[in-house]
């Protein structure tokens, strides 16, 4: 029997899946706070637009009986169980917020006919790309691969005069959900990253990684890994590193680099950190006061999901259009809306665009500094620091393959 959508006659609801298995180990109360804060803002915006309507959220909790591991790897069926709950209750909002786990989202897409929009704070994997009614509010793996390929190919910057075409990828399987799918995308033989490289090898053991650092016969000077500096230190410790090794540490959802008193530890000097440009206002928000720098982005994605719902509601109501239509379900893409922290842009496939930031450690000040930024919307790298104080020779990034014979440096222009 049909599930009725609580989505007409001046009353509009968003169904929020509150799953034990989540992309980030975030207490559900914090997610709820983010949603409620978003609802307050949406109500204000609709009122200001002269739209006298009611907007609410219904939180759908999983019972946690079957899926109690709390991580995304065991979440394949949890989203479907929650959908069954909705089906049994015969009640659904205009929009579904969640799940954040790639497996859950993928499975829900396979097993259901989703005629309503779905917003996710996560679903990072390539298997969730190009889904017609899915919107993802945290950078998916596809965006990372586009940055890496763009950066590898770049050879006309004062600090990067070589195109790279090789890489090691460290992936030991203990990564967080975002890292798991980011590295998965780099590992996949069909991915854009693999396609554009002439050599790529996945290192799965700590010892493999440690050996490469000083191996004269290594096939690449570049190692991509994902995690925070502490994760790198546990792996690398204070081991000696060959002078032309470059470690790219992907740590997108971590604002700790942008705290004023942070000094980069010595083991970070051979490392370029890829993270995201931080927002300002979120830091003082009532729901985020107790969040660590790594949790803000997840809570913010939920809040922005609510604001996106509000934006679409406003747009359709102002145009006198019906909300419970396929047109509404497919409209959550190719737009910019006013997020909590400024404008948020979604690409043609409903994936959030962002500014990625590549940081290096200044050998002079031992502080993190911005080397370049990358706009995912236009796939463009913008150099910021034209004379970086690198640890690498001549303050330039080395070639990805060390010349073992006479030192002829060929510039691949």
């Amino acid at each position: 029997s049909q599930v009725s959508q609580n989505c007409h006659n001046g009353s509009y609801e968003i169904s929020v899946l509150m799953m034990d298995n989540s992309a980030f180990a975030e207490p559900l109360e914090n997610v709820e706070d983010a949603v409620n804060e978003g609802l307050e803002i949406v109500r204000g915006r609709l009122q200001n637009a002269g739209l006298n309507v009611t907007v609410n959220a219904s939180f759908m909790y999983s019972d946690g009986l079957i899926h109690n591991s709390g991580d995304c790897r065991s979440s394949t069926c949890e989203g479907l169980d929650l959908l069954r709950k909705i089906s049994n209750a015969k009640r659904m909002g205009c929009v579904l917020m969640g799940p954040s786990c790639t497996y859950s989202t993928f499975q829900m897409y396979l097993d259901t006919e989703l005629s309503y929009p779905m917003i996710s704070a996560g679903s990072f994997g390539l298997s969730c790309d190009y889904k017609e009614t899915l919107t993802r509010l945290m950078s998916p793996a596809r965006k990372l691969t586009y940055f890496l390929v763009n950066f590898w190919k770049t050879n006309d910057l004062p600090f990067k005069t070589y195109s790279w075409s090789t890489s090691y990828v460290y992936k030991n399987g203990t990564e967080s959900e975002d890292c798991f799918w980011y590295l998965n995308a780099l590992e996949a033989s069909v991915s854009y990253f693999s396609h554009e490289l002439s050599f790529k090898l996945v290192l799965r053991q700590d010892k493999e990684f440690q050996d490469i650092l000083m191996d004269h016969n290594r096939k690449s000077n570049v190692i991509v890994m994902c995690g925070d500096p502490e994760f790198l230190y546990k792996l690398k410790g204070d081991r000696a590193v060959a002078e032309d090794i470059v470690i790219i540490l992907v740590d997108l959802f971590n604002d700790q680099y942008f705290e004023d008193n942070v000094t980069a530890p010595d083991y970070m000097k051979n490392v370029l950190v890829l993270t995201q440009s931080p927002g300002n206002s979120l830091l003082n928000s009532s729901f985020s006061r107790n969040l660590s720098p790594t949790k803000r982005d997840f809570a913010l994605a939920y809040l922005n999901g609510i604001l996106l719902f509000g934006h679409m509601l406003k747009t359709f109501l102002e145009n006198g259009e019906n909300i419970t239509t396929p047109k509404f379900a497919h409209a959550f893409r190719n737009l910019t809306f006013e997020g909590y922290d400024g404008p948020v842009t979604l690409d043609d496939w409903g994936d959030v665009d962002s500014t990625m930031v590549l940081l290096y450690t200044s050998v002079d000040t031992k502080k993190y500094k911005v080397l370049l930024t990358y706009d995912t919307h236009v796939n463009q790298t913008n150099p910021v620091d034209m004379s970086p104080t690198f640890t690498w020779k001549n303050s330039k990034l080395p070639n990805d393959i060390t010349d073992r014979g006479p030192q002829h440096h060929h510039h691949h222009h």
Partner: nanobody, 123 residues
Framework: QLQLVESGGGLVQPGGSLRLSCVTS????????IGWFRQAPGKEREGVIC???????KYADSVKGRFTISRDNAKNTVYLRMDSLKPDDTAVYYC?????????????????WGQGTQVTVSS
């Protein structure tokens, strides 16, 4: 003493590009936030872009995706690259500096200003 000198302005057609330079002296760029501002005839001065002392660019919505900022500490110079220029971008462009209290945020106000360079976008 602390000085800022802008250059690179001129007349450009809509859709064209310009690169403005701000040569600084009397201070270290690492310790200062640099802002670019503009003032069109009969309008108030507005912030266009700021580069925090840590090197984080922050853009006004009106120029995001079109303007980029970079710095070369070795040359004590900050650059403003302007692409896809529109007639609305016509103004005198100023660079300004402020001793950084935060490495990652733009200051509320700037203490030191250049004399400005004229940018005219017209066909």
């Amino acid at each position: 003493q602390l000085q800022l000198v802008e250059s690179g302005g001129g007349l450009v057609q809509p859709g064209g590009s310009l690169r403005l330079s701000c040569v600084t002296s009397g201070f270290t760029l690492d310790d200062y936030a640099i802002g670019w501002f503009r003032q069109a005839p009969g309008k108030e001065r507005e912030g266009v872009i700021c580069l925090t002392s840590g090197g984080l660019p922050k853009y006004a919505d009106s120029v995001k995706g079109r303007f980029t900022i970079s710095r070369d500490n070795a040359k004590n110079t900050v650059y403003l690259r302007m692409d896809s220029l529109k007639p609305d971008d016509t103004a005198v462009y100023y660079c300004a500096a402020s001793g950084a209290t935060s490495r990652w945020n733009c200051p509320p106000q700037y203490d030191h200003w250049g004399q400005g360079t004229q940018v005219t976008v017209s066909s």
